[in-house]
Each structure stands twice: as structure tokens, then as C-alpha cells.
Amino acid sequence: EVEKTACPSGKKAREIDESLIFYKKWELEACVDAALLATQMDRVNAIPFTYEQLDVLKHKLDELYPQGYPESVIQHLGYLFLKMSPEDIRKWNVTSLETLKALLEVNKGHEMSPQVATLIDRFVKGRGQLDKDTLDTLTAFYPGYLCSLSPEELSSVPPSSIWAVRPQDLDTCDPRQLDVLYPKARLAFQNMNGSEYFVKIQSFLGGAPTEDLKALSQQNVSMDLATFMKLRTDAVLPLTVAEVQKLLGPHVEGLKAEERHRPVRDWILRQRQDDLDTLGLGLQGGIPNGYLVLDLSMQEALS
């Protein structure tokens, strides 16, 4: 808290300008009118205030707006945003995408701070859903944003927003998140033709079920091994050697390099060695000839 003292004669600030950088903390408190500060917030960013001086300016705004700042002030906070706590931000009602962009710009190049996370949370909740423009903005600043959301939060993403997602935005997503995003992507891209569809859907395939992988295998898609390795193990296991060969096309020889990694390892264990040998890759670990394969999954389902 800054002690209340009278403003020295002739020091009363008529506008927010560079002369204020020479004011002591107590002078700023006494001589800068909070309402003036609120209307001229856009000037603060251009003035090299110290961190201590910014603390005083924040204190003045807090006193003026104890229930939370209006958006007209928030939009022009600039570096003062870095002084805000998540508790401060929870009082705000941010509805403009321009305001969001302005504040994200201040934090650009840094990890997502608790302040930014709270700001985004307030903004998205205020909008009711993650629309395309918001998603575009958030992933531009934080490529990993989408994967930081829970499956429940992702369920509010409309399929139309999926068009804004770039492959790198999904790099850190886990299978549970892709399970939610894949059906939305499938819906979003359903009217595209075969090769274009595959290019778009590829990043989401970690959530694809077996039947969709079987369908893709009929379309000459030539899936690369990096994508194949991200597929759900339970979706890959039922695929036949012929289907995997069609799915991967010329990339099928890459199975050898990944034969000890999941899902390739588990898939190999489910195939007949005879069938694996037809690939000519030297894959080992399949079911030997003459062995009977019992599918116990049906039995488990019935019991």
C-alpha cells in the first residue's frame, strides 16, 4: 500500500506523459488521477515506467475499478497486464478478440503464464465456444493451446473451427484428446476429395477407429510411418497385412525400423508369420505356421 499524501504544488498530472517517469511512487499516487489514467491507458505503454511505478498505476486502477476493469481499459493495458494476477483477471469480462490479441502480444514468445491461461479461459467461457477466429488467434500465439484443453473442453469446439488447426497444433495432444477431435475433423472435411481429405485428416488420425483406417487403405493414401505410429493400438491391431500394406503404400518398408515400437510391435504379434513374410522386410515375431488363433474378445464380450 502507498501512503496517502497530498500532491505537491504544480505537480498535478494533466495528462499521461514522459514527465511522470521522474515522479516518485508517492507522487504518482498523489498526483495522477485514476480516471485520467483510465482514459489515457494507451499512452502508458510508450513511457518507460519502472516496475515500481507500474505497481502504483495498477493500484490506482484497482481502486477505481474494484469490481474489475472495463474492456476499454483492458485493451490498452500493454505491459501493465504482466502485473495482473489471475485473481484480477477473473473479475474481467473480455469479449473483443482485439483485446485478447493485444494482451497475448504482450506475453508473446513466453510460455503460457497463469495470467494468460486465466484470460483465455474467461474469454472462451464468455463466448460459449471456441469459434474459428478465436482458435486461429490462440494457436498462432500458442501452438500447443489446443492440446492443453481437457477432452471435455474440446467437446465445445465446433467442427467448423477445425479448419483453423495446423498439424503442429496437435503435436502434444494425447489419444484422449484426438478421440474427441477426430470425429469433428471427419465432419469438417467430409466434402473433400480423397487426396485432399487425407492431407487434412492426417494430423487427427490418432483418434481414428479401425473401420476408418480400413476405408483409407482402399484409397491409395500412402500414410507415412510417423502418422502410422500415432494411430491407436486398438485401431491398428485388427488390420490385416494386406490392409497395412495398402495403407502405407511405398512406406510399408518403414515397418522394419519401427518393429519394436508400438503399435507396430503389437500388430506384428497378431499377424501370421507367413503373411508378414510376404512383405519381404524381415519382420519377425508373427504367429508361427500351424498355430490356431483364438479370438477371445467375443467370448469376453458375451461373459
Epitope: D224, E253, K256, H261
Partner: antibody
Amino acid sequence: EVQLVQSGAEVKKPGASVKVSCKASGYTFTDYNMDWVRQAPGQGLEWMGDINPSTGGTIYNQKFQGRVTMTEDKSTSTVYMELSSLRSEDTAVYYCARRRIGTGYFDVWGQGTTVTVSS
Amino acid sequence: EIVLTQSPATLSLSPGERATLSCSASSSVISSYLSWYQQKPGSSPRLLIYRTSNLASGIPARFSGSGSGTDYTLTISSLEPEDFAVYYCHQWSSFPYTFGGGTKVEIK
């Protein structure tokens, strides 16, 4: 420019552990496995294992099983190799090497990290 | 595991001469799964050839590779001063991946 930058040299006592980092840049981190290869002084190359940064799946050379742990941090595009229960014969230069998923050759190597184990 | 034996251990040649390096596997290696690396003192290895005969990016055409089964060869048609180094063959046909002991190509 594709780069693999490794952490600095380490001197450890027998029985201790060492953790070497390898930070990747200039390419899509999850499209390549990261392998670790070591080279004892005046000796040849020895493959230790690999990690798939996309899934976190690891494969270790049986020789190091139980002593080596490879991990990744996708948020920083960094992989780590920790070797425990160090002995003098673990004194070597440890390299991380990038391997495109689906291939078995290493097209980019880190600069190497010298680990010296001495009492 | 597959043991790769490289010969000779050291090859003493002059610039401009042809170098032939051998790599012999203890059991058959699928040719797609064999590669060669070059290493200079104090430096990291560098990929030269993959899949037995494919030149890696930026590697001059004087380097070539051949072979199948258990016998593989790296040839440098005409040695340049920068080619004097240690060369390693490497297989990933069988687990665990292994490297040969290396052939040192030195200036005569």
C-alpha cells in the same frame, strides 16, 4: 537449420547417475525418433536405444536395459538420456542422433557430450 | 546380435588413390538396412550412404556403396584431402542395431 544441441560435459563418480539432454530445432520434432549412440575413448560406436518423441515409446539395447532411461519433453523439443549405476567403462562421448520414423539411419547428430566416470 | 567386421582396420593411401573398405556381417543383412558413416577426429559421425548404395544429402559422388547378404563395400573413387577419416558401417536389419569397428583411412 536443423540442429541437435547437447548439454555440457559431466564428471561423475562410480555408482552415480548422469542425465544428458539433446535439444532439437529446425524440424518437426515428432516426425523423427531420437537415438543415443556412445563412443568410448579410441573405440567404435555403440547403439544404446531410441525414443519416439510423439508417443514417448522407448527401445533399449539389452546391454543397457535397467540402467538407461530415455524421456522427451515435446514442449521444448528436448530428449533426455539418463544412465544410472555408472562405472568407469561408461566413460565415453554420448551422441544423440535423429532418425526419421520408418528409417534406420541417422541423418543428423548432436555435437556429443563427454561423460567421465572416475573416483 | 549381428557382428560387423570391418577390414582393413587401417588403410594408408595417398590423395587421388582409390579406397575400398569392406564390412562383413556375421549373418545376412537385408541390403536396405545397411549404412555408412564418416567420422573425423573431434567431430560427430556424418551419414554418407544409406540403404547400401544411396548417397546422403550433400555427399560427393566419389563415394559409392554396394553389396548384399553378408558382404558390403564402401568405395571412394579418388581420395580428397578431406576424406581421411574413420568410416563405420551400421546395420539395422537385426536387433540390436550394431556398428562395425571402423576403418581408418590415413594419408600415406
